[in-house]
């Protein structure tokens, strides 16, 4: 798949036709709900789910050079070959302890909610972003992160939990999403997909992308995870895409590089501490964000969720690599660990920059369809 | 407040047994099932060394010392992980702490194993 090329930190709307076009409003699907396909490996559907994961393309990530063009989620094209139709993922997880119910797994019994009622709650993640509707927030400011570039000493811990690799983060890793919205870093990890199968947990306009990092914040308004949990904003994460591009990702491979010595599920090793900000996108200011929960169970509510705008470029070796070293439960392969996305309830997605305003020449007058909640706007 | 209590710990002749547990007790009962529960261990002197693990999924990895003679289980009903030690070595004397693993890292306070020869 070819990526249009993106114009950096230029406006939307400020190519002129062709591939600098960011997505216009005739480009929005024609029904409420973005286009579907299949059911992912995630859990049973909820009553009244409409929003249901679709899976597309192959993946991609991005070299951090200013002068490069990135991608940006408002220039991805909306029409897309339709993927195989994805089935639940069924080579995986025979549950040791046959119907414990706490054993919870992607793609299959049991269903999550039992695993978590709160996994039944109205306001899940993840979601379906659609960038026409999101509502504009000059109050969102540009993220800062403080202390993410980590000293190689002390090591870190690399771990296949049986649902995903985890990067255990040291303490001092402090992220703002605001004057007063203060974070500290404790984790991160990745979802994916299998070969020829995009394993993003968030969507754009029903596109799914290879694969999704999340890094886990807890508020600095509590001292431990389980007094955060369920608490609004006591959770924070930090989301990026990441796609397919030409060059291998150096900051990426310091992590892939070692997924070899943690094939197995429960394994784990001691990586150097590296510089996390370098496996986020590069710009700061350009974000979409939501309040849902946490996307494995117990499914937590309150969690703050910010999805950059701007990608991240893998490989195709990479992206490989990491959909086909990690073994999970049951002598089955980790992958397709994303959760189906879940209907938003009313609730509006709030974007730092003006991504459902069109001011390209296709559109008579900018559209904008929802407006900022925020205080102070 | 969370807590993460082992027990069992004790003093045994080398080729006994003995049995630890890793209790979750406060709000950590509530994300305990959820958690990638390891033992740690850490003898005078030494850097703590990982034993065992299960994932919340109920798959287990040993180290190569202790594979074929302990293994690691969950109760999730109690809110318990248990290590089985068996045929036990003058060797596996140190201090093992439970770890628990749900977003961050929770530890006990450890409790003391000594194998006399």
């Known amino acids: 798949q070819r990526l249009p090329r993106m114009q950096e930190d230029s406006p939307l709307g400020g190519g002129s036709s062709g591939e600098d076009d960011p997505l216009g409003e005739e480009d929005l699907p024609s029904e409420e709900d973005s286009p579907r396909e299949e059911d992912p490996p995630g859990e049973e559907d909820l009553p009244g789910e409409e929003d249901l994961p679709g899976e597309e393309d192959l993946p991609e990530v991005k070299p951090k050079s200013e002068e490069e063009g990135s991608l940006k989620l408002e220039d991805l094209p909306t029409v897309e070959a339709p993927g195989d139709p994805q089935e639940p993922q069924n080579n995986a997880h025979r549950d040791k302890e046959g119907d414990d119910q706490s054993h919870w797994r992607y793609g299959g019994d049991p269903p999550w909610p039992r695993v978590s009622p709160a996994c039944a709650g109205r306001f899940q993640s993840p979601v379906d972003i659609r960038p026409q509707l999101a509502a504009f927030c000059p109050a969102l400011r540009p993220l800062e992160l403080l202390g993410f570039q980590l000293p190689p000493l002390p090591e870190l811990r690399l771990r296949n939990n049986g649902h995903s690799v985890q990067l255990t983060l040291p303490p001092g890793l402090e992220m703002a999403l605001g004057p007063g919205r203060e974070y500290r870093a404790l984790q991160l990890h990745l979802h994916w997909g299998a070969a020829g199968r995009p394993g993003s947990e968030h969507t754009v306009e029903g596109h799914r992308f290879p694969a999704e990092i999340h890094v886990v914040h807890l508020s600095t308004a509590f001292a431990r995870v389980d007094e955060a949990l369920g608490r609004p904003g006591g959770l924070a994460v930090l989301a990026a895409f990441l796609e397919e591009g030409p060059e291998e990702n150096s900051a990426y491979e310091q992590l892939l590089s070692r997924l070899e010595e943690i094939a197995e599920e429960g394994s784990e090793t001691q990586v150097p501490g590296l510089d996390i900000s370098a496996l986020l996108p590069s710009d700061f200011s350009r974000y979409f964000q939501y309040e849902g929960s946490l996307t494995t169970p117990p499914c937590a509510q309150g969690v703050i969720w910010t999805v950059f705008n701007q990608t991240v470029m893998l490989s195709a070796k990479q992206l490989h690599t990491l959909s086909d070293t990690l073994w999970g439960p049951g002598d089955s392969r980790l992958q397709l660990n994303f959760r189906a996305t879940q209907p938003l309830n009313g609730r509006v997605i709030e974007a730092s920059f003006p991504a459902g305003v069109d001011s390209s020449p296709r559109a008579a007058e900018p559209v904008q369809l929802n407006s900022c909640l925020a205080a102070g706007d | 407040q969370v807590q993460l209590q082992e027990s069992g710990g004790g003093l045994v002749q080398a080729g006994g047994s003995l049995r630890l547990s890793c209790a979750a007790s406060?709000?950590?009962?509530?994300?305990?099932?959820?958690?990638?529960v390891a033992w740690y261990r850490q003898a005078p002197g030494e850097q703590r060394e990982l034993v065992a693990v299960i994932t919340s999924a109920g798959g287990t990895k040993y180290s190569d010392s202790v594979k074929g003679r302990f293994t690691i289980s969950r109760d999730n009903a109690k809110n318990t992980v248990l290590l089985q030690m068996n045929s036990l070595k003058p060797e596996d004397t140190a201090v093992y702490y439970c770890n628990a693993d749900f977003l961050q890292d929770y530890w006990g306070q450890g409790t003391q194993v000594t194998v006399s020869s």
């Open positions: 406060g709000n950590s009962v509530n994300i305990f099932r959820f958690a990638t």
